[in-house]
Protein backbone atom coordinates (compact mmCIF):
# COMPACT_ATOMS: atom_id res chain seq x y z
CA UNK A 1 0.00 0.00 0.00
CA UNK A 2 1.21 3.54 -0.72
CA UNK A 3 1.96 6.04 2.02
CA UNK A 4 -0.83 8.59 2.14
CA UNK A 5 -1.85 11.85 3.78
CA UNK A 6 -5.51 12.77 3.71
CA UNK A 7 -7.09 16.04 4.81
CA UNK A 8 -10.80 15.90 5.53
CA UNK A 9 -12.47 19.28 6.22
CA UNK A 10 -16.15 19.97 6.77
CA UNK A 11 -18.02 23.24 7.21
CA UNK A 12 -21.71 23.74 7.93
CA UNK A 13 -24.38 26.29 7.12
CA UNK A 14 -27.72 26.73 8.85
CA UNK A 15 -30.63 28.61 7.30
CA UNK A 16 -28.47 30.32 4.72
CA UNK A 17 -25.59 31.49 6.86
CA UNK A 18 -22.27 29.72 7.21
CA UNK A 19 -21.46 28.63 10.73
CA UNK A 20 -18.16 29.64 12.25
CA UNK A 21 -15.70 26.90 13.01
CA UNK A 22 -15.11 23.71 11.08
CA UNK A 23 -14.15 20.09 11.58
CA UNK A 24 -10.82 18.83 10.23
CA UNK A 25 -9.27 15.40 10.38
CA UNK A 26 -5.93 14.37 8.98
CA UNK A 27 -5.20 10.72 8.30
CA UNK A 28 -1.68 9.43 7.85
CA UNK A 29 -1.46 6.02 6.16
CA UNK A 30 -5.15 5.57 6.83
CA UNK A 31 -4.82 6.26 10.55
CA UNK A 32 -6.44 9.19 12.39
CA UNK A 33 -3.48 11.49 12.94
CA UNK A 34 -4.56 15.06 13.65
CA UNK A 35 -7.88 16.59 14.58
CA UNK A 36 -9.24 20.12 14.75
CA UNK A 37 -12.79 21.18 15.57
CA UNK A 38 -15.20 23.87 16.75
CA UNK A 39 -14.14 27.51 16.94
CA UNK A 40 -10.66 26.81 18.21
CA UNK A 41 -8.48 24.86 15.91
CA UNK A 42 -5.65 23.30 17.81
CA UNK A 43 -4.12 20.44 15.86
CA UNK A 44 -3.77 17.53 18.21
CA UNK A 45 -2.14 14.15 17.66
CA UNK A 46 -4.73 11.37 17.62
CA UNK A 47 -3.55 8.63 19.93
CA UNK A 48 -0.22 7.65 21.37
CA UNK A 49 1.22 6.51 18.06
CA UNK A 50 0.84 9.99 16.50
CA UNK A 51 2.53 11.56 19.51
CA UNK A 52 5.33 9.03 19.15
CA UNK A 53 5.80 10.01 15.51
CA UNK A 54 5.99 13.73 16.06
CA UNK A 55 7.17 13.85 19.65
CA UNK A 56 6.58 17.18 21.37
CA UNK A 57 6.57 19.20 18.16
CA UNK A 58 4.64 22.41 18.26
CA UNK A 59 1.49 22.25 16.18
CA UNK A 60 1.57 25.85 14.97
CA UNK A 61 2.16 25.01 11.34
CA UNK A 62 -0.59 22.36 11.24
CA UNK A 63 -2.95 24.64 13.12
CA UNK A 64 -2.25 27.54 10.77
CA UNK A 65 -2.69 25.44 7.61
CA UNK A 66 -5.89 23.78 8.76
CA UNK A 67 -7.37 27.08 9.94
CA UNK A 68 -6.58 28.63 6.55
CA UNK A 69 -8.14 25.69 4.72
CA UNK A 70 -11.23 25.86 6.92
CA UNK A 71 -11.63 29.57 6.22
CA UNK A 72 -11.35 28.96 2.44
CA UNK A 73 -13.95 26.21 2.61
CA UNK A 74 -16.34 28.47 4.56
CA UNK A 75 -15.97 31.10 1.83
CA UNK A 76 -16.76 28.46 -0.81
CA UNK A 77 -19.87 27.36 1.07
CA UNK A 78 -20.98 30.98 1.43
CA UNK A 79 -20.64 31.33 -2.34
CA UNK A 80 -22.94 28.43 -3.15
CA UNK A 81 -26.14 30.07 -4.35
CA UNK A 82 -28.66 27.27 -3.98
CA UNK A 83 -28.64 27.07 -0.20
CA UNK A 84 -32.07 26.30 1.14
CA UNK A 85 -33.32 26.32 4.68
CA UNK A 86 -31.97 23.77 7.10
CA UNK A 87 -28.55 22.38 7.73
CA UNK A 88 -26.08 21.92 4.85
CA UNK A 89 -22.51 20.70 4.72
CA UNK A 90 -19.60 21.20 2.39
CA UNK A 91 -16.75 18.76 2.69
CA UNK A 92 -13.34 18.81 1.05
CA UNK A 93 -11.08 15.79 1.00
CA UNK A 94 -7.55 16.22 -0.25
CA UNK A 95 -5.34 13.16 -0.61
CA UNK A 96 -1.75 12.70 -1.68
CA UNK A 97 0.09 9.41 -2.01
CA UNK A 98 3.65 8.21 -2.44
CA UNK A 99 3.84 4.75 -3.99
CA UNK A 100 6.58 2.16 -3.63
CA UNK A 101 8.05 3.10 -7.02
CA UNK A 102 8.18 6.73 -5.74
CA UNK A 103 5.40 7.81 -8.10
CA UNK A 104 2.89 10.24 -6.58
CA UNK A 105 -0.85 10.89 -6.82
CA UNK A 106 -2.87 13.83 -5.51
CA UNK A 107 -6.55 14.57 -5.70
CA UNK A 108 -9.19 16.82 -4.21
CA UNK A 109 -12.89 15.97 -3.79
CA UNK A 110 -15.85 18.14 -2.80
CA UNK A 111 -19.09 16.87 -1.27
CA UNK A 112 -22.25 18.87 -0.71
CA UNK A 113 -24.68 17.38 1.82
CA UNK A 114 -22.67 14.16 1.63
CA UNK A 115 -22.84 13.87 -2.16
CA UNK A 116 -19.74 14.04 -4.34
CA UNK A 117 -20.08 16.82 -6.90
CA UNK A 118 -16.56 17.80 -7.93
CA UNK A 119 -13.13 16.15 -8.11
CA UNK A 120 -9.75 17.33 -9.31
CA UNK A 121 -6.52 15.57 -10.09
CA UNK A 122 -4.05 17.99 -8.50
CA UNK A 123 -1.20 16.83 -10.71
CA UNK A 124 -2.92 17.24 -14.07
CA UNK A 125 -5.36 19.91 -12.78
CA UNK A 126 -8.09 17.97 -14.54
CA UNK A 127 -11.62 18.38 -13.12
CA UNK A 128 -14.33 15.72 -13.13
CA UNK A 129 -17.96 16.05 -12.15
CA UNK A 130 -20.94 13.67 -12.00
CA UNK A 131 -23.70 13.40 -14.58
CA UNK A 132 -26.68 14.72 -12.60
CA UNK A 133 -27.69 18.24 -13.67
CA UNK A 134 -28.07 19.60 -10.11
CA UNK A 135 -24.58 18.38 -9.18
CA UNK A 136 -23.17 19.73 -12.44
CA UNK A 137 -24.59 23.20 -11.83
CA UNK A 138 -23.13 23.19 -8.35
CA UNK A 139 -19.82 21.86 -9.66
CA UNK A 140 -19.50 24.55 -12.36
CA UNK A 141 -20.34 27.21 -9.80
CA UNK A 142 -17.73 26.00 -7.28
CA UNK A 143 -15.09 25.29 -9.91
CA UNK A 144 -15.37 28.81 -11.31
CA UNK A 145 -15.26 30.30 -7.82
CA UNK A 146 -12.15 28.28 -6.96
CA UNK A 147 -10.46 29.27 -10.22
CA UNK A 148 -11.17 32.97 -9.65
CA UNK A 149 -9.98 32.71 -6.06
CA UNK A 150 -6.82 30.92 -7.16
CA UNK A 151 -6.06 33.69 -9.64
CA UNK A 152 -6.62 36.34 -6.96
CA UNK A 153 -4.48 34.65 -4.35
CA UNK A 154 -1.93 33.29 -6.85
CA UNK A 155 -2.57 29.83 -5.43
CA UNK A 156 -1.92 27.07 -7.90
CA UNK A 157 -3.25 23.57 -7.60
CA UNK A 158 0.13 21.98 -8.19
CA UNK A 159 1.28 23.92 -5.12
CA UNK A 160 -1.39 22.15 -3.07
CA UNK A 161 -0.05 18.90 -4.49
CA UNK A 162 3.54 19.84 -3.62
CA UNK A 163 2.63 21.06 -0.12
CA UNK A 164 0.75 17.87 0.66
CA UNK A 165 3.63 15.70 -0.52
CA UNK A 166 6.17 17.83 1.35
CA UNK A 167 4.14 17.42 4.52
CA UNK A 168 3.78 13.67 3.96
CA UNK A 169 7.52 13.28 3.43
CA UNK A 170 8.21 15.30 6.57
CA UNK A 171 5.96 13.00 8.60
CA UNK A 172 7.50 9.90 7.09
CA UNK A 173 10.98 11.14 7.89
CA UNK A 174 10.08 11.83 11.48
CA UNK A 175 9.39 8.26 12.48
CA UNK A 176 9.86 4.54 12.27
CA UNK A 177 6.21 4.85 12.36
CA UNK A 178 4.02 4.04 9.60
CA UNK A 179 5.18 0.68 8.53
CA UNK A 180 4.90 -0.34 12.14
CA UNK A 181 3.01 -3.45 13.12
CA UNK A 182 1.15 -3.79 16.37
CA UNK A 183 0.19 -7.40 17.14
CA UNK A 184 -3.36 -8.09 18.27
CA UNK A 185 -4.48 -9.12 21.71
CA UNK A 186 -6.64 -12.21 21.20
CA UNK A 187 -9.34 -13.14 23.65
CA UNK A 188 -11.68 -16.17 23.47
CA UNK A 189 -14.95 -16.18 25.37
CA UNK A 190 -17.91 -18.53 25.54
CA UNK A 191 -21.59 -17.94 26.08
CA UNK A 192 -24.67 -20.12 26.33
CA UNK A 193 -26.54 -20.35 23.06
CA UNK A 194 -29.15 -23.08 23.52
CA UNK A 195 -29.55 -26.48 25.15
CA UNK A 196 -26.28 -28.36 24.70
CA UNK A 197 -24.71 -25.64 22.55
CA UNK A 198 -22.38 -22.78 23.33
CA UNK A 199 -21.25 -19.86 21.22
CA UNK A 200 -17.54 -19.21 21.23
CA UNK A 201 -16.26 -15.79 20.23
CA UNK A 202 -12.72 -14.87 19.36
CA UNK A 203 -11.86 -11.18 19.55
CA UNK A 204 -8.71 -9.57 18.23
CA UNK A 205 -8.02 -5.99 19.25
CA UNK A 206 -5.33 -3.33 19.20
CA UNK A 207 -3.70 -4.45 15.95
CA UNK A 208 -2.17 -2.55 13.04
CA UNK A 209 -2.30 -2.69 10.05
CA UNK A 210 -5.91 -3.72 9.58
CA UNK A 211 -5.34 -6.86 7.47
CA UNK A 212 -5.92 -9.92 9.66
CA UNK A 213 -7.02 -13.54 9.37
CA UNK A 214 -9.24 -14.68 12.20
CA UNK A 215 -11.10 -17.97 11.97
CA UNK A 216 -12.28 -20.96 13.94
CA UNK A 217 -10.69 -24.38 13.48
CA UNK A 218 -12.01 -27.74 14.53
CA UNK A 219 -9.28 -30.33 15.10
CA UNK A 220 -6.91 -27.97 13.27
CA UNK A 221 -9.10 -27.70 10.18
CA UNK A 222 -10.86 -24.47 9.22
CA UNK A 223 -14.61 -24.49 9.73
CA UNK A 224 -16.66 -23.77 6.63
CA UNK A 225 -17.63 -20.14 6.12
CA UNK A 226 -21.33 -20.77 6.63
CA UNK A 227 -20.72 -21.95 10.21
CA UNK A 228 -18.84 -18.81 11.28
CA UNK A 229 -19.93 -15.22 11.73
CA UNK A 230 -17.47 -12.38 11.35
CA UNK A 231 -17.53 -8.81 12.57
CA UNK A 232 -16.13 -6.02 10.44
CA UNK A 233 -12.58 -4.85 11.05
CA UNK A 234 -13.20 -1.51 12.79
CA UNK A 235 -10.95 1.26 14.09
CA UNK A 236 -10.85 1.25 17.89
CA UNK A 237 -9.96 4.93 18.25
CA UNK A 238 -6.33 4.36 19.20
CA UNK A 239 -4.94 4.17 15.70
CA UNK A 240 -5.42 0.39 15.81
CA UNK A 241 -8.20 -2.03 14.83
CA UNK A 242 -10.47 -4.66 16.28
CA UNK A 243 -12.58 -7.53 14.94
CA UNK A 244 -14.19 -10.81 16.01
CA UNK A 245 -15.38 -14.19 14.76
CA UNK A 246 -17.93 -16.46 16.40
CA UNK A 247 -19.24 -19.97 15.93
CA UNK A 248 -21.65 -22.31 17.70
CA UNK A 249 -20.35 -25.62 19.06
CA UNK A 250 -21.57 -28.54 21.14
CA UNK A 251 -20.89 -28.24 24.83
CA UNK A 252 -18.23 -30.76 25.85
CA UNK A 253 -16.38 -30.46 22.53
CA UNK A 254 -14.53 -27.27 23.43
CA UNK A 255 -11.09 -28.92 23.36
CA UNK A 256 -11.49 -29.61 19.63
CA UNK A 257 -11.81 -25.94 18.74
CA UNK A 258 -9.19 -23.23 18.44
CA UNK A 259 -9.24 -19.69 17.15
CA UNK A 260 -6.55 -19.16 14.52
CA UNK A 261 -5.08 -15.70 14.06
CA UNK A 262 -2.63 -14.52 11.42
CA UNK A 263 -1.36 -10.94 11.29
CA UNK A 264 1.66 -9.36 9.59
CA UNK A 265 3.38 -12.70 9.08
CA UNK A 266 2.81 -13.91 12.65
CA UNK A 267 0.23 -16.44 13.74
CA UNK A 268 -1.19 -17.95 16.91
CA UNK A 269 -3.85 -20.41 18.02
CA UNK A 270 -6.12 -19.87 21.00
CA UNK A 271 -8.12 -22.61 22.74
CA UNK A 272 -11.62 -22.24 24.11
CA UNK A 273 -11.51 -21.67 27.88
CA UNK A 274 -12.86 -24.68 29.73
CA UNK A 275 -15.11 -24.66 32.75
CA UNK A 276 -18.09 -22.50 33.48
CA UNK A 277 -19.87 -20.49 30.85
CA UNK A 278 -18.51 -16.98 31.26
CA UNK A 279 -21.18 -14.87 29.58
CA UNK A 280 -24.78 -15.80 30.18
CA UNK A 281 -26.09 -14.12 27.08
CA UNK A 282 -27.02 -15.28 23.59
CA UNK A 283 -24.24 -14.31 21.27
CA UNK A 284 -26.59 -13.81 18.40
CA UNK A 285 -27.87 -10.78 20.31
CA UNK A 286 -24.24 -9.68 20.44
CA UNK A 287 -24.20 -9.92 16.68
CA UNK A 288 -27.14 -7.61 16.27
CA UNK A 289 -25.41 -5.24 18.62
CA UNK A 290 -22.27 -5.42 16.49
CA UNK A 291 -24.23 -4.86 13.30
CA UNK A 292 -25.65 -1.77 14.94
CA UNK A 293 -22.10 -0.59 15.51
CA UNK A 294 -21.23 -1.43 11.94
CA UNK A 295 -24.21 0.53 10.72
CA UNK A 296 -23.00 3.55 12.67
CA UNK A 297 -19.60 3.23 11.04
CA UNK A 298 -21.24 2.78 7.65
CA UNK A 299 -23.20 5.96 8.28
CA UNK A 300 -19.99 7.68 9.24
CA UNK A 301 -18.42 6.46 6.02
CA UNK A 302 -21.22 8.04 4.04
CA UNK A 303 -20.90 11.29 5.90
CA UNK A 304 -17.13 11.38 5.98
CA UNK A 305 -16.34 9.38 2.84
CA UNK A 306 -13.79 7.26 4.56
Amino acid sequence: EPHSLRYNLTVLSGDGSVQSGFLAEVHLDGQPFLRCDRQKCRAKPQGQWAEDVLGNKTWDRETRDLTGNGKDLRMTLAHIKDQKEGLHSLQEIRVCEIHEDNSTRSSQHFYYDGELFLSQNLETEEWTMPQSSRAQTLAMNVRNFLKEDAMKTKTHYHAMHADCLQELRRYLKSGVVLRRTVPPMVNVTRSEASEGNITVTCRASGFYPWNITLSWRQDGVSLSHDTQQWGDVLPDGNGTYQTWVATRICQGEEQRFTCYMEHSGNHSTHPVPSGKVLVLQSHWQHHHHHHGLNDIFEAQKIEWHE
Epitope: R217, D219, V221, S222, H267, T269, P271
Partner: antibody
Protein backbone atom coordinates in the same frame (compact mmCIF):
# COMPACT_ATOMS: atom_id res chain seq x y z
CA UNK B 1 7.02 -28.19 -0.32
CA UNK B 2 5.63 -29.71 2.87
CA UNK B 3 7.64 -32.67 4.14
CA UNK B 4 7.39 -34.83 7.26
CA UNK B 5 10.47 -36.94 7.90
CA UNK B 6 10.12 -39.65 10.53
CA UNK B 7 12.79 -41.46 12.54
CA UNK B 8 14.00 -44.92 11.53
CA UNK B 9 12.66 -48.36 12.48
CA UNK B 10 12.82 -49.49 16.11
CA UNK B 11 13.19 -52.99 17.53
CA UNK B 12 12.32 -52.93 21.24
CA UNK B 13 11.71 -55.41 24.02
CA UNK B 14 8.32 -55.85 25.70
CA UNK B 15 7.84 -53.45 28.60
CA UNK B 16 10.27 -50.91 27.13
CA UNK B 17 9.37 -47.58 25.63
CA UNK B 18 10.18 -45.79 22.38
CA UNK B 19 10.11 -42.23 21.08
CA UNK B 20 9.20 -41.69 17.42
CA UNK B 21 10.09 -38.33 15.87
CA UNK B 22 8.57 -36.41 12.98
CA UNK B 23 10.53 -33.45 11.59
CA UNK B 24 8.49 -30.96 9.60
CA UNK B 25 9.78 -28.70 6.84
CA UNK B 26 8.41 -26.54 4.03
CA UNK B 27 5.86 -24.65 6.16
CA UNK B 28 5.50 -22.79 9.46
CA UNK B 29 5.54 -25.65 11.95
CA UNK B 30 3.36 -23.97 14.60
CA UNK B 31 0.63 -23.17 12.09
CA UNK B 32 -0.87 -26.64 11.73
CA UNK B 33 -1.58 -29.63 13.97
CA UNK B 34 0.45 -32.83 13.86
CA UNK B 35 -1.65 -36.02 13.87
CA UNK B 36 -0.48 -39.55 14.67
CA UNK B 37 -1.90 -42.72 13.10
CA UNK B 38 -1.17 -46.41 13.74
CA UNK B 39 -1.27 -49.16 11.12
CA UNK B 40 -0.81 -52.71 12.34
CA UNK B 41 0.51 -55.18 9.77
CA UNK B 42 -2.04 -55.83 7.05
CA UNK B 43 -4.69 -53.91 8.98
CA UNK B 44 -6.55 -50.63 8.69
CA UNK B 45 -5.57 -47.27 10.18
CA UNK B 46 -6.20 -46.09 13.74
CA UNK B 47 -6.02 -42.47 14.85
CA UNK B 48 -3.96 -41.99 18.02
CA UNK B 49 -4.22 -38.26 18.66
CA UNK B 50 -3.04 -34.82 17.62
CA UNK B 51 -1.04 -31.93 19.02
CA UNK B 52 -1.22 -28.20 18.33
CA UNK B 53 2.47 -27.24 18.02
CA UNK B 54 1.74 -23.60 18.84
CA UNK B 55 0.49 -24.20 22.38
CA UNK B 56 1.14 -27.90 22.97
CA UNK B 57 -2.56 -28.72 23.39
CA UNK B 58 -3.46 -32.34 22.65
CA UNK B 59 -6.58 -34.34 21.85
CA UNK B 60 -6.31 -38.12 22.03
CA UNK B 61 -8.17 -41.28 21.21
CA UNK B 62 -9.23 -42.67 24.60
CA UNK B 63 -7.82 -46.04 23.53
CA UNK B 64 -4.28 -44.62 23.43
CA UNK B 65 -4.38 -42.52 26.60
CA UNK B 66 -1.67 -43.80 28.91
CA UNK B 67 0.02 -45.47 25.95
CA UNK B 68 1.03 -42.50 23.78
CA UNK B 69 2.35 -39.09 24.88
CA UNK B 70 2.54 -36.34 22.26
CA UNK B 71 5.04 -33.47 22.47
CA UNK B 72 6.73 -30.96 20.19
CA UNK B 73 10.01 -29.08 20.04
CA UNK B 74 9.23 -25.81 18.28
CA UNK B 75 12.90 -24.86 17.91
CA UNK B 76 13.59 -27.88 15.71
CA UNK B 77 10.10 -28.12 14.13
CA UNK B 78 9.84 -31.67 15.41
CA UNK B 79 6.90 -33.58 16.87
CA UNK B 80 7.40 -36.62 19.07
CA UNK B 81 5.28 -39.56 20.14
CA UNK B 82 6.44 -41.48 23.18
CA UNK B 83 5.03 -45.02 23.47
CA UNK B 84 5.44 -46.81 26.80
CA UNK B 85 4.96 -50.28 28.31
CA UNK B 86 5.21 -51.82 24.89
CA UNK B 87 3.64 -55.17 24.03
CA UNK B 88 3.39 -57.14 20.79
CA UNK B 89 0.05 -55.36 20.19
CA UNK B 90 2.01 -52.15 19.73
CA UNK B 91 4.03 -53.56 16.82
CA UNK B 92 2.96 -51.44 13.87
CA UNK B 93 3.90 -48.69 11.46
CA UNK B 94 3.28 -45.27 13.04
CA UNK B 95 2.63 -42.29 10.81
CA UNK B 96 2.63 -38.59 11.53
CA UNK B 97 0.52 -36.35 9.30
CA UNK B 98 -0.37 -32.69 9.04
CA UNK B 99 -3.05 -30.58 7.44
CA UNK B 100 -3.32 -27.72 4.96
CA UNK B 101 -6.14 -26.34 7.08
CA UNK B 102 -8.89 -27.83 4.90
CA UNK B 103 -8.65 -31.60 5.39
CA UNK B 104 -7.29 -33.57 8.30
CA UNK B 105 -4.44 -35.72 7.00
CA UNK B 106 -3.23 -33.84 3.94
CA UNK B 107 0.48 -34.69 4.19
CA UNK B 108 1.97 -37.86 5.64
CA UNK B 109 5.37 -38.90 6.93
CA UNK B 110 6.96 -42.03 5.48
CA UNK B 111 6.10 -44.05 8.58
CA UNK B 112 8.17 -45.57 11.39
CA UNK B 113 8.07 -49.32 11.93
CA UNK B 114 8.11 -50.28 15.61
CA UNK B 115 8.64 -53.97 16.31
CA UNK B 116 8.16 -55.25 19.86
CA UNK B 117 9.89 -58.56 20.33
CA UNK B 118 11.89 -60.33 22.98
CA UNK C 1 -17.26 -44.56 18.11
CA UNK C 2 -18.49 -44.14 14.55
CA UNK C 3 -17.89 -47.35 12.60
CA UNK C 4 -17.23 -47.04 8.87
CA UNK C 5 -18.00 -50.14 6.83
CA UNK C 6 -16.50 -50.32 3.36
CA UNK C 7 -17.60 -52.57 0.57
CA UNK C 8 -16.40 -54.50 -1.22
CA UNK C 9 -13.42 -55.62 0.86
CA UNK C 10 -11.48 -56.54 -2.27
CA UNK C 11 -12.21 -56.22 -5.97
CA UNK C 12 -10.49 -56.76 -9.28
CA UNK C 13 -11.21 -54.58 -12.29
CA UNK C 14 -10.07 -54.32 -15.88
CA UNK C 15 -8.40 -51.17 -17.22
CA UNK C 16 -11.04 -48.71 -18.45
CA UNK C 17 -13.70 -50.13 -16.14
CA UNK C 18 -15.74 -47.87 -13.84
CA UNK C 19 -15.27 -48.60 -10.13
CA UNK C 20 -17.45 -47.63 -7.18
CA UNK C 21 -16.48 -48.17 -3.55
CA UNK C 22 -19.01 -47.47 -0.80
CA UNK C 23 -18.56 -46.37 2.79
CA UNK C 24 -21.42 -46.74 5.25
CA UNK C 25 -21.32 -44.92 8.60
CA UNK C 26 -22.90 -46.27 11.78
CA UNK C 27 -24.34 -42.80 12.45
CA UNK C 28 -24.97 -39.76 10.30
CA UNK C 29 -22.05 -37.46 9.57
CA UNK C 30 -21.86 -34.12 7.78
CA UNK C 31 -20.34 -34.29 4.30
CA UNK C 32 -17.64 -31.84 5.44
CA UNK C 33 -16.15 -34.56 7.62
CA UNK C 34 -15.78 -37.49 5.19
CA UNK C 35 -12.46 -38.02 3.40
CA UNK C 36 -10.88 -40.71 1.20
CA UNK C 37 -7.26 -41.94 1.14
CA UNK C 38 -5.31 -44.13 -1.25
CA UNK C 39 -2.49 -46.36 0.00
CA UNK C 40 -0.27 -48.12 -2.48
CA UNK C 41 1.68 -51.19 -1.26
CA UNK C 42 4.73 -50.18 0.77
CA UNK C 43 3.80 -46.48 0.86
CA UNK C 44 2.13 -44.02 3.22
CA UNK C 45 -1.54 -43.22 2.71
CA UNK C 46 -2.24 -40.26 0.41
CA UNK C 47 -5.17 -37.87 0.61
CA UNK C 48 -7.42 -38.47 -2.40
CA UNK C 49 -10.71 -36.68 -1.75
CA UNK C 50 -11.60 -34.34 1.10
CA UNK C 51 -14.97 -33.15 2.36
CA UNK C 52 -16.81 -35.86 0.37
CA UNK C 53 -16.26 -34.51 -3.14
CA UNK C 54 -13.18 -32.25 -3.37
CA UNK C 55 -10.19 -33.64 -5.22
CA UNK C 56 -6.89 -33.23 -3.38
CA UNK C 57 -4.04 -31.52 -5.19
CA UNK C 58 -2.57 -33.60 -8.02
CA UNK C 59 -5.34 -36.22 -8.00
CA UNK C 60 -6.56 -37.16 -11.52
CA UNK C 61 -10.07 -36.09 -12.51
CA UNK C 62 -11.16 -39.69 -13.04
CA UNK C 63 -11.61 -39.87 -9.25
CA UNK C 64 -14.80 -38.46 -7.73
CA UNK C 65 -16.69 -38.68 -4.47
CA UNK C 66 -20.28 -38.19 -3.36
CA UNK C 67 -22.72 -38.96 -0.59
CA UNK C 68 -24.40 -37.63 2.53
CA UNK C 69 -25.67 -38.76 5.91
CA UNK C 70 -24.55 -42.36 6.42
CA UNK C 71 -23.84 -43.30 2.81
CA UNK C 72 -20.76 -42.21 0.84
CA UNK C 73 -19.00 -43.45 -2.26
CA UNK C 74 -15.75 -43.13 -4.20
CA UNK C 75 -15.82 -43.58 -7.96
CA UNK C 76 -13.00 -44.15 -10.44
CA UNK C 77 -14.39 -43.23 -13.87
CA UNK C 78 -11.98 -45.42 -15.83
CA UNK C 79 -9.69 -47.80 -13.98
CA UNK C 80 -5.95 -47.52 -14.72
CA UNK C 81 -3.11 -49.83 -13.69
CA UNK C 82 -1.65 -47.17 -11.38
CA UNK C 83 -4.89 -47.17 -9.35
CA UNK C 84 -4.02 -50.52 -7.78
CA UNK C 85 -4.09 -49.71 -4.05
CA UNK C 86 -6.13 -49.96 -0.88
CA UNK C 87 -8.71 -47.20 -0.43
CA UNK C 88 -9.87 -45.97 2.98
CA UNK C 89 -12.71 -43.67 3.97
CA UNK C 90 -12.27 -41.64 7.18
CA UNK C 91 -14.57 -39.54 9.33
CA UNK C 92 -13.56 -36.43 11.28
CA UNK C 93 -17.00 -35.68 12.65
CA UNK C 94 -16.53 -37.11 16.12
CA UNK C 95 -13.66 -38.13 18.36
CA UNK C 96 -12.11 -40.61 17.93
CA UNK C 97 -11.56 -40.17 14.20
CA UNK C 98 -12.12 -43.52 12.53
CA UNK C 99 -11.17 -45.14 9.22
CA UNK C 100 -13.00 -47.74 7.16
CA UNK C 101 -11.49 -51.21 7.03
CA UNK C 102 -10.27 -50.55 3.48
CA UNK C 103 -11.07 -51.73 -0.03
CA UNK C 104 -8.24 -53.47 -1.86
CA UNK C 105 -8.41 -52.76 -5.58
CA UNK C 106 -6.55 -55.08 -7.92
CA UNK C 107 -6.24 -55.23 -11.69
CA UNK C 108 -7.57 -58.13 -13.78
Amino acid sequence: QVQLKQSGPELVKPGASVKVSCKASGYAFTKYNIYWVKQSHGKSLEWIGYIDPYNGGTVQNQKFKGKATLTVDKSSSTAYMHLNSLTSEDSAVYYCATTDGYSLFTYWGQGTLVTVSS
Amino acid sequence: DIVLTQSPTTMAASPGEKITITCSASSSISSNYLHWYQQKPGFSPKLLIYRTSNLASGVPARFSGSGSGTSYSLTIGTMEAEDVATYYCQQGSSIPFTFGSGTKLEIK
